[in-house]
């Protein structure tokens, strides 16, 4: 065979700098918890122990390609491709294997494809119980007075970045599209950046190509949708390193624009401002329930 050996694009466990060297990777995923004793047992699945101030962190250095070639993981989640599955195994430090090529189908159909973590999709399984199927990152709250699917999506950390969605409505940020999708329990996709205009034909919004398969929710993906209809988040390119001071840079593929997802306690376009409201006791955000 003439198949090239080794890495085809740097998506393996190491960034170009290699293990133990000083690196500058566009997609460096570090586990949040310190690894006090960083060794082969505490930093597995392609992770590399890195010094981080006082402690050590298990760094998962994966520069994944974003071709949408879904695989079903042994944890029941669908991943954008096998690289994202491996990256998830590293990030969560648990074994995840490919159990099937193609998405995990626990039911007929699935969700919106845009979720919270890593700009990723929500879980692929629908969660069944008294509520019936809860989709689009909704969870069943059986303790609630009116049993229903509860949406705990928090969009407060996102900067202003208006988008036009497939339901014909304008939203102040892609996160709010996910929230609406969750609340309404229906698929709502991002059509384009900016508010909806009179020229937007709602009959065409969200319409899919004849040859394209319906795409299920994807876990731990940068969620670059490769068809023209939907603009989702993907990691920012290397030239935008440092764009977000205290937050995560996310790239909206369809519009080629960057957006910052701020860490708790920061706000502003580049997450450069301290959000003093975090210092005060704020009433808990009311759960949004779909009955």
């Amino acid at each position: 065979s003439n198949q090239p050996p080794g890495g085809g694009g740097g998506s393996g466990g190491d960034c170009p700098g290699g293990k133990g060297k000083s690196i500058n990777c566009s997609e460096l995923n570090v586990r949040e918890s310190d690894v006090r004793v960083c060794d082969e047992s505490s930093c597995k699945y392609g992770g590399v122990c890195k010094e981080d101030g006082d402690g050590l962190k298990c760094a998962c250095q994966f520069q994944c390609h974003t071709n949408y070639i879904p695989v079903c993981g042994s944890n029941g989640d669908t991943y954008q491709n096998e690289c994202f599955l491996r990256r998830a195994a590293c990030k969560h430090q648990k074994e995840i294997t490919v159990i099937a090529r193609g998405p995990c189908y626990s039911d007929n159909g699935s969700g919106s494809g845009e979720g919270e973590e890593e700009g990723s999709g929500a879980e692929v399984h629908r969660k069944h119980s008294k509520c019936g199927p809860c989709k689009y990152k909704a969870e069943c709250d059986e303790d609630a007075e009116n049993v229903g699917c509860v949406c705990n999506i928090d969009c407060s950390g996102y900067s202003f970045n208006p988008v036009c969605a497939s339901d014909g409505s304008s939203y102040n940020n892609p996160c709010f599209v996910r929230e609406a999708s969750c609340i309404k329990q229906e698929q709502i996709d991002i059509r384009h950046l900016g508010h909806c205009t009179d020229t937007d034909d709602t009959s065409l919004l969200g319409k899919k190509d004849d040859g394209l398969q319906y795409r299920p929710d994807v876990k731990d993906a940068s969620d670059q949708r490769e068809d023209v209809y939907i603009g989702n988040h993907m990691p920012c390119p290397e030239n935008l390193n440092g764009y977000c001071i205290h937050g995560k840079c996310e790239f909206i593929y369809s519009t080629q624009k960057a957006s910052c997802r701020c860490e708790s306690g920061y706000t502003g376009q580049h997450c450069e401002k301290t959000d003093f409201s975090i210092l005060y006791v704020v009433p808990s955000r009311q759960k949004l329930t779909h009955v």
Epitope: S1, N2, Q3, P4, G6, G7, G8, G9, G10, S11, G12, P16, S26, Q63, H65, T66, N67, Y68, I69, P70, N81, E82, C83, L85, R86, R101, G102, P103, G211, L212, Q213, Q224, E226, P237, E238, N239, F251, Q256
Partner: antibody, heavy 121, light 107 residues
Amino acid sequence: QVQLVESGGGVVQPGRSLRLSCAASGFTFTTYGMHWVRQAPGKGLEWVAVVWFEGNSKFYIDSVKGRFIISRDNSKNTLFLQMNSLRAEDTAVYYCARANCGADCYPFDYWGQGTLVTVSS
Amino acid sequence: DIQMTQSPSSLSASVGDRVTITCRASQGISNYLAWYQQKPGKVPKLLIYAASTLQSGVPSRFSGSGSGTDFSLTISSLRPEDVATYYCQKYNSAPWTFGQGTKVEIK
């Protein structure tokens, strides 16, 4: 050895349809993404479409969306391109090519010899 | 979609010359870049993948470099058999766009 053999090209009138085939041999077909690439006479290469592995993921260049359908028959190790509503600008040599993408991704290491599609009235 | 821009569109050099072709992506593509050689009337042939990895069987006078948005293909000492059109291609995500090509001729 790896072989990709295209067929189905020919002269067709605008608005009509044509179905291209690519017979693959010498490798495990299901472990590769299969692509169509075209080259208009005297012009550069243009990627057209891909179908991955089991056929559950496929993508197209904008100019052929809604007109062309890529598919594969893994039991016969064959790739297809159904071309509908053909236009003069679809005139080109059409190549099939294989690419391996999984945990990592590789470009086209093998190409077919190409089949010429001429759209003319 | 990400655009791939090659320069120059054509060049003429002498046998033994060092030749460099550049390719620029409109957005970062990490090192998911390939270079192909297409001789007149022939099928394209993979030269370089992952921006800098030489494909098996390709002469060592060919080399690639770059990451992110800027890439280059270098022929360290041009040979008559290198007369061809060279294409770059991104493959990190669909569409797998090609550059417009660079035609290399011998003076």
